[in-house]
C-alpha cells in the first residue's frame, strides 16, 4: 500500500495509472467503499462522499491512462485509505494528513515560549523535528516547546514530520517582538544634550500600546517615572512627563527621547517598558547614562564621572600631547597645582576613549576657562 503525506490546508494529488494509455472507466472510493469520483465517458462524476466539493481530477490526463484524485483544502479527517478501481484492479493509497500550528499567535514577545502543536490522524505515530532560524534543532512528538524566545528566533522555522519513512515539511514564520538591543549606554559631558533611541527589531503594520521610562538616578534614593506615553498606529503621544528632567519624545517610531542637558543628578540607569495591545507581557530595554564633569577649583583640577561604569574603565587626566598625569580605575581623579594649558579628562576602556572633556587651565593669576 502506497503512503502519501499531506499538509492541512494544502492540496494533494493521489495518482492512479492504467496500463492502457487511453481514457477508460475509473472510480475513486474511500475505505468505506463510498464513491468519491469517477468518470462516465469524458464527464467527471461525483459520489456522496464528504469530499464532494473538494475533490477533483485532471481530465487532461485521462487520455494518457492517468486518473488522479485531487483533494483541496486538506483536513486531518481526510486521512484514510483511498482506492482507485480501474481495469478490474484496485490501487490503494493511504493518505495521512498532518497540521502544525503555533500555540496562539506567531507574534511572540521576547522571553515568551513558543509551542508548536502537531495535529495528526488517529493511529499515526509521527516524529517531528524543527530547525530554528539560528540553526537550533528541537525534536518531539505531538508538541514541541521552546522557552525563553530570543531575537534570533525570529524568522522561518522549518519543521519536518516523519511517518512511515515519508516526510512532510512545514514552514512557520515566527516574529519575536523585541527591542533591537537589550541594553545601551550613553556617555556624555555635563551640559550636552542626550539622545536615547529605542529601535524595535520588528515591523508590523499597526503598532498600538503604551509605555514608560522608569529611572534610577545614581544619586537618588529611589527610582521614578521620567515619562509615560501611548502608541497608536505607530504615532507616539506623551501622557505624562516629569518636571525635572523635562524629557522630549519624538512623535514617530523608533521611540526617541531627548534629555536637554546631561547633569550629574540624572546619571544612572533606566528601563523603558513597552506594553503592546493584545499581548500579555512587556518589552524592556535598559538604558544607562554616564556623565562627566571636569572642574578647576583654586589649585585643584578634578575630573568626575557619574553613572553605571564598569570597574575596568580608566579615568585619566592629562595635559594635551603629554603622558597621563593621573590614571585610575575610579570615578574621580584630580591633579593639584596643574600646569597651565589644555587638560583632557578621558574615560577609556582598554585604550578606547569613551568620553572626553577638555578644560583650559590658565596661569595662576587668572580664572579657568571651559571651552
Amino acid at each position: 500500500k502506497k503512503v502519501v503525506l499531506g499538509k492541512k490546508g494544502d492540496t494533494v494529488e493521489l495518482t492512479c495509472t492504467a496500463s492502457q494509455k487511453k481514457s477508460i472507466q475509473f472510480h475513486w472510493k474511500n475505505s468505506n467503499q463510498i464513491k468519491i469520483l469517477g468518470n462516465q465517458g469524458s464527464f467527471l462524476t461525483k459520489g456522496p462522499s464528504k469530499l464532494n466539493d473538494r475533490a477533483d481530477s485532471r481530465r487532461s490526463l485521462w487520455d494518457q491512462g492517468n486518473f488522479p484524485l485531487i483533494i483541496k483544502n486538506l483536513k486531518i479527517e481526510d486521512s484514510d485509505t483511498y482506492i482507485c478501481e480501474v481495469e478490474d484492479q484496485k490501487e490503494e493509497v493511504q493518505l495521512l494528513v498532518f497540521g502544525l500550528t503555533a500555540n496562539s499567535d506567531t507574534h511572540l514577545l521576547q522571553g515568551q515560549s513558543l509551542t508548536l502543536t502537531l495535529e495528526s490522524p488517529p493511529g499515526s505515530s509521527p516524529s517531528v523535528q524543527c530547525r530554528s532560524p539560528r540553526g537550533k534543532n528541537i525534536q518531539g512528538g505531538k508538541t514541541l516547546s521552546v522557552s525563553q524566545l530570543e531575537l534570533q528566533d525570529s524568522g522561518t522555522w522549518t519543521c519536518t514530520v516523519l511517518q512511515n519513512q515519508k516526510k512532510v515539511e512545514f514552514k512557520i514564520d515566527i516574529v519575536v517582538l523585541a527591542f533591537q538591543k537589550a541594553s545601551s549606554i550613553v556617555y556624555k559631558k555635563e551640559g550636552e544634550q542626550v539622545e536615547f533611541s529605542f529601535p524595535l527589531a520588528f515591523t508590523v503594520e499597526k503598532l498600538t500600546g503604551s509605555g514608560e521610562l522608569w529611572w534610577q538616578a545614581e544619586r537618588a534614593s529611589s527610582s521614578k517615572s521620567w515619562i509615560t506615553f501611548d502608541l497608536k498606529n505607530k504615532e507616539v503621544s506623551v501622557k505624562r512627563v516629569t518636571q525635572d528632567p523635562k524629557l522630549q519624545m519624538g512623535k514617530k517610531l523608533p521611540l526617541h527621547l531627548t534629555l536637554p542637558q546631561a547633569l550629574p543628578q540624572y546619571a544612572g540607569s533606566g528601563n523603558l517598558t513597552l506594553a503592546l495591545e493584545a499581548k500579555t507581557g512587556k518589552l524592556h530595554q535598559e538604558v544607562n547614562l554616564v556623565v562627566m564633569r571636569a572642574t578647576q577649583l583654586q589649585k585643584n583640577l578634578t575630573c568626575e564621572v557619574w553613572g553605571p561604569t564598569s570597574p575596568k574603565l580608566m579615568l585619566s587626566l592629562k595635559l594635551e600631547n603629554k603622558e597621563a598625569k593621573v590614571s585610575k580605575r575610579e570615578k574621580a581623579v584630580w591633579v593639584l597645582n596643574p600646569e597651565a594649558g589644555m587638560w583632557q579628562c578621558l574615560l577609556s576602556d582598554s585604550g578606547q576613549v569613551l568620553l572626553e572633556s577638555n578644560i583650559k587651565v590658565l596661569p595662576t593669576w587668572s580664572t579657568p576657562v571651559q571651552p
Epitope: S210, K224, S225, K239, R240, Q243, A275
Partner: antibody
C-alpha cells in the same frame, strides 16, 4: 520609609467648609504627583483630584469641580484639599495618595481622615 | 468618563482555591490598569500595575492579564491573608476611575 498622614477631617454641616491636610515624609515630595481618593462608608473608592509636582496642573472629578480645590506646599511637604459647599454625599474617608508607582499607579496611601457632612 | 465594571461583586472561596476577578473598561485603556487590595479599616494597597506587572513585595500568587478593555486578576492559591476587597483602576484618562470592588470572603 514613605509616610502620608492626613488631618483636618471631622463633622461639618451641609454647605460648610473644611480643609484637609496631608503631611508627607520619607520621599522627595516635590518630585511626585499627588492625589486625593475618597471612600463613602461601606462603598467603593472614588478618585477626587490630583496635582502635579509644582502645582501648575490640577484635575478633578466632575462631582467636586468648583467646590473643592487641591493645592500643595512643597516647602512644607504638604498636600491640601479645600472643600467648600459640602454636601451629605461628600461624607467619606479621604485618603492622601502618592502617584509614584510605575505606570501612574497609586503606590502609597495615607491611613485616611473621616469627613462627615450632616445637620 | 471611563466606566470600570468588576465581576463578580463577591466570591466565597476556601484557602488554596484559585480565584479570578474580571474588570471591563467601557473603552480601550491599553495597559493603564492597576489592581488594589483593601482590608476592612485599612487603606488600599497596590498589587498590580500596567495590567500585568507585580508590585514589589507582592506575593507571586497574584497575577494580572489583559489589555484594551478586558482585564483579569488571578489569585492562584488563596491564603488566609488574601480575604479582602479588590479594586481595579484605570489611569488612561481623567478622571481616574475604580471598579465597584470584589469582596473575596471565606466560604
Amino acid at each position: 520609609e514613605v509616610q502620608l498622614v492626613e488631618s483636618g477631617g471631622g463633622l461639618v454641616q451641609p454647605g460648610g467648609s473644611l480643609r484637609l491636610s496631608c503631611a508627607a515624609s520619607g520621599f522627595t515630595f516635590s518630585s511626585y504627583w499627588m492625589s486625593w481618593v475618597r471612600q463613602a462608608p461601606g462603598k467603593g473608592l472614588e478618585w477626587v483630584a490630583n496635582i502635579n509636582e509644582d502645582g501648575s496642573e490640577k484635575y478633578y472629578v466632575d462631582s467636586v469641580k468648583g467646590r473643592f480645590t487641591i493645592s500643595r506646599d512643597n516647602a512644607k511637604n504638604s498636600l491640601y484639599l479645600q472643600m467648600n459647599s459640602l454636601r451629605a454625599e461628600d461624607t467619606a474617608v479621604y485618603y492622601c495618595v502618592r502617584e509614584g508607582g510605575q505606570w501612574l499607579a497609586l503606590d502609597y496611601w495615607g491611613q485616611g481622615t473621616l469627613v462627615t457632612v450632616s445637620s | 468618563d471611563i466606566q470600570m465594571t468588576q465581576s463578580p461583586s463577591s466570591v466565597s472561596a476556601s484557602v488554596g482555591d484559585r480565584v479570578t476577578i474580571t474588570c471591563r473598561a467601557s473603552q480601550g485603556i491599553s495597559s493603564w490598569l492597576a489592581w488594589y487590595q483593601q482590608k476592612p479599616g485599612k487603606a488600599p494597597k497596590l498589587l498590580i500595575y500596567a495590567a500585568s506587572s507585580l508590585q514589589s513585595g507582592v506575593p507571586s500568587s497574584f497575577s494580572g492579564s489583559g489589555s484594551g478593555t478586558d482585564f483579569t486578576l488571578t489569585i492562584n492559591s488563596l491564603q488566609p491573608e488574601d480575604f479582602a476587597t479588590y479594586y481595579c483602576q484605570q489611569a488612561n484618562s481623567f478622571p481616574w476611575t475604580f471598579g465597584q470592588g470584589t469582596k473575596v470572603a471565606i466560604k
